[in-house]
Interface confidence: low
């Protein structure tokens, strides 16, 4: 009991003057508070509190539930306490079965004893199962048993308070431990799509998925550089223990161009925060932009292959694509595919595969594409490079030798004379006339060149070579001369 010092207020005195009292069930509890400034008695056990304004607390027939702390308080706010155990062989434990523990913190299994003289006050697993090896506890007969540093693995652990009474083990009602997880990482946030492209009037709806260990994670949609509160709808699920998922859906029922911008899904817990963004672009109408992947003017050698490739952006999705040549639509030889398999993809590729091109297949190849809002096209001019072909080589009635050659690019015709004994023609002969015959004809295809020389200049037996060439190759034709006296006896053209 507290001692009294004159001049300063002292705590009340309690009779009997003990810190603890053991009473048998059914007997009387009589406690007297001695203090000139008595105010009240207070009784506390588990979550129960009772008050009494009489200075003598009397319980005529004590029950196990009268076990607890009795505190007397005076007008100075000073108090003294006595703890009363009501020994009841039929009720060794008082229990509050709600048991929650925060991960990494201590938690109290509230099973105070009604008899302090029992032994082996401890925790036991239900149905004889052992407790987790790393579970540590501290018993206190007046409060219960404290589990130290609760682990997430203890969630849903079933246990009893236990004590030995007169040589027999007695178990309390069972407790189920519910562990509230500690946040040890930031929430995991994700959005249904990273970007959205819409036309005016279309609905914008985006879902943010927030994953964390418990539902106390905070989340919200925000518009960057704006304080406006956005309207969200929520769905949530517990996928087993410590696996909580929330879906926060943001909707703008009729999007406008000025709704374009960056929207952030933000989530935080006591560990930290995380966010993810999605970009909304609202356009007043759809579009198509075409980008050639090769030069739109193409030169290709006769017999070779060429691929005409375009990339294009189309929104909404392209509905019709075609490749056209000379007013004819290709039904095969081309493919069209999305550049990416991402749902928000608006970029596509179209390839026309031209194989073993002939000199006659030069021309304009056009790619056309349309969607519900617009159409667009791009043209490729394809030139087929061909080796010169000598179309005619003749001696004209006026004594001229004439060579006509066709090819692309435009062939050049050179003339050579070789004496009868020479195998190689090297002496060049200047033409008297050179003409490009179809310069004003169609823009694609072979160009025809005509060149003439005067055969009267040749006084000896020999051979004249007409050589037509361009970047692709060369072709020759030959004229043989034989003189008899002063007359040219024959001129034999051959290739």
């Amino acid at each position: 009991q507290p001692s009294v010092s004159p001049g300063e207020p002292s705590p009340p005195s309690i009779h009997p003057a003990k810190s603890e009292l053991i009473v048998r069930v059914g007997n009387e509890i009589r406690l007297l508070c001695i203090d000139p400034g008595f105010v009240k008695w207070t009784f506390e056990i588990l979550d129960e509190t009772n008050e009494n304004k009489q200075n003598e607390w009397i319980t005529e027939k004590a029950e196990a539930t009268n076990t607890g702390k009795y505190t007397c308080t005076n007008k100075h706010g000073l108090s003294s306490s006595i703890y009363v155990f009501v020994r009841d062989p039929a009720k060794l434990f008082l229990v509050d079965r709600s048991l929650y523990g925060k991960e990494d913190n201590d938690t109290l299994v509230r099973c105070p004893l009604t008899d302090p003289e029992v032994t082996s006050y401890s925790l036991k697993g239900c149905q004889g199962k052992p407790l987790p090896k790393d579970l540590r506890f501290v018993p206190d007969p007046k409060a219960g048993i404290t589990i130290k540093s609760v682990k997430r693995a203890y969630h849903r652990l079933c246990l009893h308070c236990s004590a030995d009474q007169e040589g027999k083990s007695v178990l309390s009602d069972k407790f189920i431990l519910k562990v509230r997880p500690a946040f040890k990482a930031v929430p995991v946030v994700s959005v249904s799509k990273a970007s959205y492209l819409l036309r005016e009037g279309e609905e914008f709806t985006v879902t943010c998925t927030i994953k964390d260990v418990s539902s106390s994670v905070y989340s919200t949609w925000k518009r960057e550089n704006s304080q406006t509160k956005l309207q969200e709808k929520y769905n949530s699920w517990h996928h087993g223990d410590f696996n909580y998922e929330r879906q926060a859906t943001l909707t703008i029922s009729s999007a406008r161009v000025n709704d374009s911008g960056v929207f952030m899904c933000y989530a935080n817990n006591t560990f930290g925060s995380a966010n993810v963004t999605t970009t909304l672009e609202v356009v007043d109408k759809g579009f198509i932009n075409i980008f050639p992947m090769i030069n739109t003017t193409v030169f290709v050698n006769d017999g070779e292959n060429v691929d005409l490739i375009v990339e294009y952006e189309a929104f909404p999705k392209p509905e019709h694509q075609q490749w056209i040549y000379m007013n004819r639509t290709f039904t095969d030889k081309w493919e069209d595919y999305p550049k990416s398999e991402n749902e928000s993809n608006i970029r596509y590729v179209s390839e026309l595969h031209l194989t073993r091109l002939k000199g006659t297949e030069g021309g304009t190849y056009t790619f056309l594409v349309s969607n519900s809002d617009v159409n667009a096209s791009i043209a490729f001019n394809v030139y087929v490079n061909t080796k010169p072909e000598i179309l005619t080589y003749d001696r004209l009635v006026n004594g001229m030798l004439q060579c006509v050659a066709a090819g692309f690019p435009e062939p050049t015709i050179d003339w050579y004379f070789c004496p009868g004994t020479e195998q190689r023609c090297s002496a060049s002969v200047l033409p008297v006339d050179v003409q490009t015959l179809n310069a004003s004809g169609p823009p694609f295809g072979k160009l025809v060149v005509q060149s003439s020389i005067d055969s009267s200049a040749f006084k000896h037996n020999g051979t004249v070579e007409c050589k037509a060439y361009n970047d692709v190759g060369k072709t020759s034709a030959y004229f043989n001369f034989a003189f008899k006296g002063n007359n040219k006896e024959q001129i034999h053209p051959h290739t």
Epitope: V188, S190, V191, S192, K193, A194, T209, W237, H239, V276, T278, S340, E341, N342, E343, S344
Partner: antibody, heavy 122, light 106 residues
Framework: EVQLVESGGGLVQPGGSLRLSCAAS????????MAWVRQAPGKGLEWVAN????????YYLDSVRGRFTISRDNAKNSLYLQMNSLRAEDTAVYYC???????????????WGQGTTVTVSS | EIVMTQSPATLSLSPGERATLSCRAS??????LNWYQQKPGQAPRLLIY???RLQSGIPARFSGSGSGTDYTLTISSLEPEDFAVYYC????????FGGGTKVEIK
């Protein structure tokens, strides 16, 4: 318990067809991306096809595009792979896998079935 | 197509040793990298996603790091059950796996 069980594998001649099925249980099937991944004998893993959980968008490995079709029936908690014009190089164990996500459109495969064997041989 | 290259093809180590497995992408994959473990006759198992995030239920001896095109899986102290084939997988553009690294007992 989250579980994926594949079926429908077997021996088929080149040019033939097979339909693989994957039965899902223990989770809300319609909430997840699903995929087929294959593994040729003694070789590594090769992603084959994916199907999105919302719009049913499909994605394919280039070498199977036009021959294989991935589909799903959310009401039956089932994923399918229709394989036509099969070739010897399609011989593999085919795994059904669940896609979970992190970030924006980035996915990983967090649950796998035990696989079903497809052998293409004459 | 993004090509994933793993090295070495085989790693011979003893239990208790540290294992370092490499994975290189043919282009920047923005940390969109996952690691899987596969034992003979079993399906692959996800270990790590988004370069360094440990999948639930995976022991803390597994860790991942890297950025850009170069990524690493580290097993701090090999346990007998860790001897298996490990695959990396990118999720930046469609999905492709590396050829695998076999971790075998020395």
């Amino acid at each position: 318990e989250v579980q994926l069980v594949e079926s429908g594998g077997g021996l088929v001649q080149p040019g033939g067809s097979l339909r693989l099925s994957c039965a899902a249980s223990g989770f809300t099937f319609s909430d997840y991306y699903m995929a087929w991944v294959r593994q040729a004998p003694g070789k590594g893993l090769e992603w084959v096809a994916n199907i999105n959980q919302i719009a049913g968008s499909t994605y394919y490995l280039d070498s199977v595009r036009g021959r294989f079709t991935i589909s799903r029936d959310n009401a039956k908690n089932s994923l399918y792979l229709q394989m036509n014009s099969l070739r010897a190089e399609d011989t593999a164990v085919y795994y059904c896998a669940r896609g979970d996500y992190y970030g924006t459109t980035y996915w990983y495969f967090d649950v796998w079935g035990q696989g079903t064997t497809v052998t293409v041989s004459s | 197509e993004i090509v994933m290259t793993q090295s070495p093809a085989t790693l011979s180590l003893s239990p208790g040793e540290r294992a370092t497995l490499s994975c290189r992408a043919s282009q920047d994959i923005s940390n969109y990298l996952n690691w899987y473990q596969q034992k003979p006759g079993q399906a692959p198992r996800l270990l790590i996603y988004y370069t360094s995030r440990l999948q639930s239920g995976i022991p803390a001896r597994f860790s991942g790091s890297g950025s850009g095109t170069d990524y690493t899986l580290t097993i701090s102290s090999l346990e007998p059950e860790d001897f298996a084939v490990y695959y990396c997988q990118q999720g930046k553009k469609l999905w492709s796996f590396g050829g695998g690294t076999k971790v075998e007992i020395k």
